[in-house]
């Protein structure tokens, strides 16, 4: 039995709740988590509560919880080590996810180098408020082992989400891997759509549509690159892309006088803060193929 002086601190990884035994006449309570990076996470706790809930934490590296409670009589300080139990090197590794085509997400991982042959991995996702848990609906397998997950419904996700890969085996304990990921960092944009080029005698105007995204973004959040090149150019002649900031009406006007040779323009998009470029759009062509035309781009 625990001595009366102990707070009996315990942690529930499912709810990220740290709880302790309530003390009479508590005047002050604080709880902390310290990770191996030297990062301290401290949730709000009121004196009437004997628990706190962590949101912004990853546990797979092993963490230390700490609770400080002052009462009118004495001070309590107690630590709880939360290791990643299981054999070292058995956890899923090289974990990554990406959102694509607005509504879909793929996550992939590799089996741990020390994982036994019968290892099986399971992915759980919680939104940042920990209010909803999604279990992977469709696993990608390699020789029967889950090494990826495909989601076709992202409605439960928020701007930052918690990913947990648990493992099971009949032979040994398997360590878990967890990660917090920003949707901003993992979304791959579709290329811009409706790329059109209209030319007059002296200029050409390129227009395009902002790609639809999973995140709610404004035009200010977009950066575009335009690749305007002459058709049938010699291999090895590379054009520098033209950078254009997102605007309410996405357009780029450039001088190009008649007669003009056959050209193609393609566009790609990225988040200005991330610069993970989308693939290039379909090329839109302008100009003509007639041999006597001079290039005035």
């Amino acid at each position: 039995e625990k001595p009366a002086s102990s707070l009996n601190v315990r942690f529930d990884a499912r709810t990220m709740n740290l709880t302790w035994d309530c003390q009479e006449n508590t005047t002050f309570s604080r709880c902390f988590l310290t990770d191996k990076k030297g990062r301290v996470v401290e949730p709000r706790v009121t004196n009437k509560e004997c628990s706190c809930t962590f949101r912004e934490i990853c546990l797979h590296g092993g963490v230390t919880f700490e609770v400080h409670v002052n009462t009118s009589q004495r001070t309590f300080q107690e630590k709880l080590l939360y290791p990643n139990s299981g054999r070292e090197g058995t956890a899923a590794q090289n974990f990554s996810c990406f959102i694509y085509n607005v509504d879909f997400m793929n996550c992939t991982w590799a089996r741990g180098p020390k994982a036994p042959r019968d290892v099986q991995y399971f992915l759980y996702i919680q939104n940042s408020k920990r209010r909803r848990e999604i279990q992977c609906p469709y696993y990608i397998e390699d020789s029967g082992t889950h090494v990826g997950c495909h989601l076709g419904n992202l409605s439960g996700l928020t701007s930052r989400n918690y990913f947990l890969v648990n493992g099971t085996s009949q032979e040994i304990g398997i360590q878990f891997f967890d990660s917090l990921l920003d949707t901003k960092k993992i979304e791959r944009f579709n290329p811009p759509g409706n790329v059109t080029v209209r030319c007059n005698t002296t200029h050409c105007l390129v227009r395009w549509k902002q790609p639809r995204t999973y995140q709610k973004l404004s035009y200010l959040d977009f950066q575009y690159q335009l690749d305007v090149h002459r058709k049938n150019m010699q291999p090895g002649t590379e054009n520098l892309p033209i950078n254009v900031s997102g605007d309410l009406e996405n357009r780029y006007n450039f001088p190009s006088s008649e007669p003009r040779a056959k050209h193609a323009v393609k566009i790609r998009a990225a988040d200005v803060r991330i610069l993970n470029w989308s693939s290039w759009s379909e090329a839109a062509e302008f100009g003509s193929d007639e041999r006597h035309h001079h290039h005035h781009h």
Epitope: K37, R39, V40, V41, E42, P43, R44, F54, R55, E56, K129, S159, R160, L180, D182, K184, Q223, N243, A270, D271, V272, R273, I274, L275, N276
Partner: antibody
């Protein structure tokens, strides 16, 4: 347009505590995460930590554990940084900062800064 | 933690000249890098994010480039108001570390 306005300069004795405020206008405090960055005289910028006013969670560097408290008053849209057991090396300009898409544990660059509060620790 | 190293510590140039400031990360930070300008008695001002995207209201003489570990801030033609201290900051990995700064002074 968002603005962050900080409290005035403070002179403190070693061992004392200081509480710096950062009033937000143009947004409500709960829409933001407030980060604190300090700058010792003639030195570079040091990120201290971040605070999420919506759920009260704080993240900071271990070197500040036991000495730092970040809080917020949503009724006045004001964030606070309290630093206790002050020592001479805490003498610095303390800035609150935030930005578009800045959350508790993520920033994509701090677009908005307070004007800074000079805290001098001297016996 | 990721260490950000800026060079040179001081750069002496004249108005109208081109300035090239460097920032190196101790490990890859992808394109998660910001540049700030700080003038005496003022708070830092965000110039560049995403390594190369200009923040709102920043003149186009400021440009950023690089990814991974090596980054450059270029001021194509120095104006008198550009003389200040410049800091880079990585936001790929906690804690979000700053470089020690490059002081751009008038020659």
């Amino acid at each position: 347009q968002m603005q962050l306005v900080q409290s005035g300069a403070e002179v403190k004795k070693p061992g004392a505590s200081v509480k710096v405020s950062c009033k937000v206008s143009g947004y409500t405090l709960t829409e933001l995460s407030i980060h604190w960055v300090r700058q010792a005289p003639g030195k570079g910028l040091e990120w201290m930590g971040g605070f999420d006013p919506e759920d009260g969670e704080t993240i900071y560097a271990q070197k500040f554990q036991g000495r730092v408290t970040m809080t917020g008053d949503t009724s006045t849209d004001t964030a606070y940084l309290e630093l206790s057991s002050l020592r001479s090396e805490d003498t610095a300009l303390y800035y609150c900062a935030t930005g578009r898409y800045t959350s508790l544990a993520t920033t994509y660059g701090f677009d908005y800064w307070g004007q800074g509060t000079l805290v001098t620790v001297s016996s | 933690e990721i260490v950000m190293t800026q060079s040179p510590a001081t750069l002496s140039l004249s108005p109208g000249e081109r300035a090239t400031l460097s920032c190196r990360a101790s490990q890859s930070v992808s394109s998660y890098l910001a540049w700030y300008q700080q003038k005496p008695g003022q708070a830092p001002r965000l110039l560049i994010y995403g390594a190369s995207s200009r923040a709102t209201g920043i003149p186009d003489r400021f440009s950023g480039s690089g990814s991974g570990t090596d980054f450059t801030l270029t001021i194509s033609r120095l104006e008198p108001e550009d003389f200040a201290v410049y800091y880079c900051q990585q936001y790929d990995n906690w804690p979000y570390t700053f470089g020690q700064g490059t002081k751009l002074e008038i020659k």
